[in-house]
């Protein structure tokens, strides 16, 4: 065609896949009458007539474009709907009169790829691989034209590097004409890459300009040999007997080696393997002072059979021995003096305290307690506490009972007990003294005696309330080698008038339980009196 060499560059029309391309015939009125135009598509330099305009009316030609073309803008523009990648070609309009002229339009088609799908090597990468290994893949599906991929490590783009970094990209054409890009990042990794963040970026163009999509960031499992093995003890800080102590082996390799924990035998100085749990942890529970000693860990790489030994670690389980008090069972006369001495061993400095057992009152800070001018009331329990101030909770105690010679001493001299006739009463009487007294009752009934402590005794008596008993009352007598003493229990009949708010309070330690003789015992203390029976 004459003058074809001077053809101007085609007009560029850019459109996204699936949208409508507006192909405006740019012939001027002098070049041709737009009411008489032929439209062609050019593919591989072959022209195909696709649309005719006659007297401003359009008509599609049979073929691939038949259903997708229509006229717009009073016949000057051809609209192509549902654009596909296959539509990327030159379209031309040709005016017929006054002379044959043509106008060329280059249609460019774009489609953003899907979000890149990044996948990491599921088996991981050893640092000593001979060749660069497949680290990760990046797939960008259904883009047009082919997007460009850039790999990043820790936010920096990765460049091809001989024998170190190799990026292998390939693409496949889907039946839709869209491209799927697969990029494989091959690299020789180093130990420091275990924390590296990798991602890929797809760069693509749309009619609106350049765009990019980033994958999620991934880390790669990196395998590297162990260089160092060490022991870790939990809890950290001072350990004491009774604690749960965990000794574990750690290594700086991935995967970690096979661990074993040994303790040095103090007598043979040989290392003896300890039994660990399934996780390779040596659990000492409860920890004892015998667990103290020198521990070390061995890490064995099962691939190379190389064995590494940790620095030995000294473990100290702090303890306090049994506490000894002397004298162990002191007996003294009233008015005399007594010195109590407390001893114990420990892995740390000890602090001693003496406490009164009954009250918890601190009597002395130190291992020696001196008691002068002993009274009967001074008899009873004294506790020595040996503790390690630097280790909270590490202490041992010993109780010593001080006996003061003396006749029985009653918990109460006399008391009133509310009763009902024909009830079984449960009476109690308490006495103390040294030697420990025994208790007897002045009435028949079922009595039982209970030793409360070395100097104290409690006797309980079950007895039926009779008119005679009401008259005589009940006495309990406590006796030992040094004398005797008596407590009196006055029995008072319950009637409605005696049930005043104050009448049911008594003093002392005695409890009385009243129940009808004809019924099974129902136990109640004096503070809650039984309901009086209505006598009809």
């Amino acid at each position: 065609v004459p003058g074809e060499a001077e053809q101007p560059a085609p007009e560029l029309v850019e459109v996204e896949v699936g949208s409508t391309a507006l192909l405006k015939c740019g012939l001027s009125q002098s070049q041709g009458n737009l009411s008489h135009v032929d439209w062609f598509s050019v593919h591989k330099e072959k022209r195909t007539l696709i649309f005719r305009v006659r007297q401003g009316q359009g008509q599609s030609e049979p073929g691939e474009y038949e259903q997708r073309l229509s006229l717009q803008d009073r016949g000057a523009t051809l609209a192509l709907t549902q654009v596909t990648p296959q539509d990327e070609r030159i379209f031309l309009c040709q005016g017929k009169r006054p002379r044959s002229q043509e106008y060329r339009i280059q249609l460019r088609v774009y489609k953003a790829p899907e979000e890149p799908n990044i996948q990491v090597n599921p088996l991981g990468i050893p640092v000593n691989s001979k060749e660069p290994e497949e680290v990760a893949t990046c797939v960008g599906r259904n883009g047009y034209p082919i997007p460009q991929v850039i790999w990043y490590k820790n936010g920096r783009p990765l460049k091809e590097e001989k024998n170190r970094v190799h990026i292998q990209s390939s693409q496949t054409v889907e039946s839709s004409g869209l491209y799927t890009l697969q990029s494989i990042l091959k690299a020789q990794l180093v130990k420091e890459d275990k924390d590296a963040q990798f991602y890929c970026e797809l760069n693509y163009r749309l009619p609106s300009g350049n765009h990019m999509k980033e994958s999620r960031e991934v880390t790669v499992p990196v395998f590297y040999p162990t260089e160092k093995v060490w022991l870790e003890v939990e809890p950290v800080g001072m350990l004491k007997e009774g604690d749960r102590v965990e000794i574990r082996c750690l290594a700086d390799g991935n995967p970690p080696p096979h661990f074993s924990i040994s303790k040095q035998n103090p007598s043979t100085r040989e290392a003896e393997e300890e039994t660990t749990n399934d996780n390779g942890v040596l659990v000492l529970e409860p920890a004892r002072k015998e667990h103290s000693g020198r521990y070390e860990c061995q890490g064995l790489d099962l691939d190379t059979m190389i064995s590494l030994l940790s620095e030995p670690q000294e473990l100290l389980v702090n303890y306090v021995s049994d506490v000894r008090v002397s004298p162990a069972a002191p007996e003294r006369q009233e008015g005399s003096s007594l010195t109590l001495t407390c001893e114990a061993e420990s892995s740390q400095d000890l602090e001693f305290q003496w406490l009164r057992e009954e009250t918890g009152q601190v009597l002395e800070r130190g291992p020696v307690l001196q008691l002068h001018d002993l009274k009967r009331e001074a008899g009873g329990g004294y506790r020595c506490v040996a503790s390690v101030p630097s280790i909270p909770g590490l202490n041992r105690t010993q109780l010593v009972n001080v006996a003061i010679f003396g006749p029985p001493w009653m918990a109460f001299k006399e008391r009133k007990v509310w009763v009902k006739e024909n009830m079984v009463l449960n009476l109690s009487c308490e006495a103390s003294g040294h030697p420990r007294p025994t208790i007897s009752w002045n009435v028949n009934g079922t009595a039982s005696e209970q030793d409360q402590d070395p100097q104290r005794v409690l006797s309980t008596l079950n007895v039926l309330v009779t008119p005679e008993l009401l008259e005589t009352g009940v006495e309990c007598t406590a006796s030992n080698d040094l004398g005797k003493n008596t407590s009196i229990l006055f029995l008072e009949l319950v009637n409605l008038t005696t049930l005043t708010p104050d009448s049911n309070t008594t003093t002392g330690l005695s409890t009385s339980t009243a129940s009808p003789h004809t019924r099974a015992n129902s136990t109640s203390t004096e503070r809650k009196l039984p309901e009086p029976e209505s006598r009809g």
Epitope: L123, S129, E134
Partner: antibody
Amino acid sequence: QVQLKESGPGLVQSSQTLSLTCTVSGFSLTSNGVSWVRQPPGKGLEWIAAISSGGSTYYNSAFKSRLSISPNTSKSQVLLKMNSLQTEDTGMYFCARHRPFYFDYWGQGVMVTVSS
Amino acid sequence: DIQVTQSPSLLSASVGDRVTLNCKGSQNIYKSLAWFRLKRGEAPKLLIYDANSLQTGIPSRFSGSGSGTDFTLTITSLQPEDVATYFCQQYYSGYTFGAGTKLELK
């Protein structure tokens, strides 16, 4: 086209060593990794070991101490050795090609019976 | 280790049926999941990779979907030759397979 074929003894005595060979064609062992997978009778598939295109070896930790995988690149073969065989090791053994992380082509498998 | 649970273990369907097989990961595996068909005496065949990509040469009646922990293999119109055992496999961390779904004709 891509092909993989497993070969090895059909019957092995317990406590003995099993040697299996995977012969590949249509691709190179320097461009694709290969895995071994087994299927005990009436059970599911279980990954055993792999060798990467770069020559790195990987093992299922359940078998690690008794496995060895190695390539013979010139013969396009991957060899699997499993020692201390037990009757539970009876099953169909497959080799499969990596592309690069999923398995796109498999062999037909070889049946291995471990007799006591 | 990542566990993969397949359901159902047995499925009976008729020719032409739409069939759905499920696979569940014990943790997020993104799209690192493949589906295989296993027939006695044949090499296992890859159907779907990357959760939803159809392997070359596999009929378009097969499709995969899902991401994260829940995945599905769908056969839109069951054919007699589809009778087989189907396995899913995760390749996010190591390689583990589901126990399989045996698909049979009613």
